[in-house]
C-alpha cells in the first residue's frame, strides 16, 4: 500500500531512508535537457523475495536535443548517488536497514538523472531526519518517521527532532565549559515516559533504534 503523503517536513531538517521497503517506487527523472528514452521505464521498483530484494527496471535518460540517439546509459553499481543531506548532528547513526529482509539499498545513479529523487513510499517505510548545516539537534539520537496505516488511511509518525540555529553558543563569564557528548548509543533505562512530542524525551530501547519505549505507544 502506497503512502498517501510525503514524510513530514521538519523546519531546518532533511530526511533520508537508509533502505527502501519492497513496493517502493523511484521516478525515472532526468535533468534539464534530457528525457527518458522512448519505451523507457517510468519508475524503478523495489521487488524481491524473502531472501533478496533489488530494483526492477532501469532508468535511462537521453538528450532532448537528439531524437535518434543510440546511447542508452545503464546504472553503474560502483557509484553511489550523493544525497542532499548533511552528516547526522548526533554521534549516533541509524542501523543499516539495507541488511533487513524485504528492503532495497539506495539505487545507484544513472547518467543525467535529475538532482532530486522522487520516491513513492509504502506502508512500513522508515525515514531518518537530520538537521541541515548551520543547525543542531536539541536532543541526541535518531529522529525517525514511519508510514503507518491507521483506520484505513496512511499517515507518517511525527519525528522527534528540533533543529536550532547556532546563534548563542558563546558562554557567559565564569560559566563552565560544556561537556563532551558521550560517544555511541545512550543506555536505555527500565522505566519509560508517558508523553511524546517533538518537545520530547525519547528513551530508546536497547533492542532497536527504530522505536523508543514511549514513542511506540502513541505512533
Amino acid at each position: 500500500e502506497l503512502c498517501d503523503d510525503d514524510p513530514p517536513e521538519i523546519p531546518h531538517a532533511t530526511f533520508k531512508a537508509m533502505a527502501y521497503k519492497e513496493g517502493t517506487m523511484l521516478n525515472c527523472e532526468c535533468k534539464r535537457g534530457f528525457r527518458r528514452i522512448k519505451s523507457g521505464s517510468l519508475y524503478m521498483l523495489c521487488t524481491g523475495n524473502s531472501s533478496h530484494s533489488s530494483w526492477d527496471n532501469q532508468c535511462q535518460c537521453t538528450s532532448s536535443a537528439t531524437r535518434n540517439t543510440t546511447k542508452q546509459v545503464t546504472p553503474q553499481p560502483e557509484e553511489q548517488k550523493e544525497r542532499k543531506t548533511t552528516e547526522m548532528q548526533s554521534p549516533m547513526q541509524p542501523v543499516d536497514q539495507a541488511s533487513l529482509p524485504g528492503h532495497c539499498r539506495e539505487p545507484p545513479p544513472w547518467e543525467n538523472e535529475a538532482t532530486e529523487r522522487i520516491y513513492h513510499f509504502v506502508v512500513g517505510q522508515m525515514v531518518y531526519y537530520q538537521c541541515v548545516q548551520g543547525y543542531r539537534a536539541l536532543h541526541r539520537g535518531p529522529a525517525e518517521s514511519v508510514c503507518k496505516m491507521t483506520h484505513g488511511k496512511t499517515r507518517w509518525t511525527q519525528p522527534q527532532l528540533i533543529c536550532t540555529g547556532e546563534m548563542e553558543t558563546s558562554q557567559f563569564p565564569g560559566e563552565e565549559k560544556p561537556q563532551a557528548s558521550p560517544e555511541g548509543r545512550p543506555e536505555s533505562e527500565t522505566s519509560c515516559l508517558v508523553t511524546t512530542t517533538d518537545f520530547q524525551i525519547q528513551t530508546e530501547m536497547a533492542a532497536t533504534m527504530e522505536t523508543s519505549i514511549f514513542t511506540t505507544e502513541y505512533q
Epitope: 523546519p11 553558543t169 520530547q200
Partner: antibody, heavy 114, light 111 residues
Framework: EVQLLESGGGLVQPGGSLRLSCAAS????????MHWVRQAPGKGLEWVSV????????YYADSVKGRFTISRDNSKNTLYLQMNSLRAEDTAVYYC???????WGQGTLVTVSS | QSVLTQPPSASGTPGQRVTISCTGS?????????VHWYQQLPGTAPKLLIY???ERPSGVPDRFSGSKSGTSASLAISGLRSEDEADYYC???????????FGGGTKLTVL
C-alpha cells in the same frame, strides 16, 4: 518512573542570587535538551532557558539574558539555573522540564522581595 | 505579552463541546512547528494533553482533540465534564527565539 525534582528556591532580596537545581531520574538524561520554564503567581507559563543534550549550546529568553545561566552535569543527571541580579518580576514558580518541554517537575518557588 | 494568542476564558455546560483557539506567527506555528496543548489543574504542574497538533498521549480521553492550520491551532473538548475545569495552554517551538513559546492560557469553566 521519570522524575524531575527541583530545589534551591526561596526568598531573596532584589539584586541577590540563587542557584536552582533539578535532579533527573528514570530516563537517559544525557540524551535530551532541558529547559527552565517559570510561572509568576496567577500568570501564564514563560520559557526561561534551554540547554542542548550535551551542553554545547544554550538559549535564553530576552527577559533573563545576561543575568541567568543554564548548565548541566550529565554525570550527575542534574540541571542548574544560576540566577543573578534578581528582580521582583522574577518571582515565580520555576519548573525544570525535559525535552522541550513534555515532562515537568513540580516546581520550586522563587520570591524576590525586600 | 504572550507570543501565542489564546482567549483568556472559555466556558460550557457538562456535555457540551468547547473549542479554544491559539494563534501564532510565521516564526512558530506558521513555520511548520508542531502545536502542543497542556492542561494545568490548580496548584499542579502542566500536563501534556495534545502533542504534534492532534495526537493524544495514552491516558488522555478521546474527548480531547487538536488541529492546526496555517498559523493557528485549536483544541476541542467534547462531552465536557466538571473535571475538565482547568487552565489550558498551547505551545510551539519558535525558530526566531530558539525556544518554545506559550499562549497566555485559557481558563475553562464548566458551568
Amino acid at each position: 518512573e521519570v522524575q524531575l525534582l527541583e530545589s534551591g528556591g526561596g526568598l531573596v532580596q532584589p539584586g541577590g542570587s540563587l542557584r536552582l537545581s533539578c535532579a533527573a531520574s528514570g530516563f537517559t538524561f544525557s540524551s535530551y535538551g532541558m529547559h527552565w520554564v517559570r510561572q509568576a503567581p496567577g500568570k501564564g507559563l514563560e520559557w526561561v532557558s534551554v540547554i542542548s543534550y550535551d551542553g554545547s549550546y544554550k538559549y535564553y529568553a530576552d527577559s533573563v539574558k545576561g543575568r541567568f545561566t543554564i548548565s548541566r552535569d550529565n554525570s550527575k543527571n542534574t540541571l542548574y539555573l544560576q540566577m543573578n541580579s534578581l528582580r521582583a518580576e522574577d518571582t515565580a514558580v520555576y519548573y525544570c522540564a525535559a525535552g522541550v518541554p513534555d515532562y515537568w517537575g513540580q516546581g520550586t518557588l522563587v520570591t524576590v522581595s525586600s | 505579552q504572550s507570543v501565542l494568542t489564546q482567549p483568556p476564558s472559555a466556558s460550557g455546560t457538562p456535555g457540551q463541546r468547547v473549542t479554544i483557539s491559539c494563534t501564532g506567527s510565521s516564526s512558530n506555528i506558521g513555520a511548520g512547528y508542531d502545536v502542543h496543548w497542556y492542561q494545568q489543574l490548580p496548584g499542579t504542574a502542566p500536563k501534556l494533553l495534545i502533542y504534534s497538533n492532534n495526537e493524544r498521549p495514552s491516558g488522555v480521553p478521546d474527548r480531547f482533540s487538536g488541529s492546526k492550520s496555517g498559523t493557528s491551532a485549536s483544541l476541542a473538548i467534547s462531552g465536557l465534564r466538571s473535571e475538565d475545569e482547568a487552565d489550558y495552554y498551547c505551545a510551539a517551538w519558535d525558530g526566531s527565539l530558539n525556544g518554545p513559546v506559550f499562549g497566555g492560557g485559557t481558563k475553562l469553566t464548566v458551568l
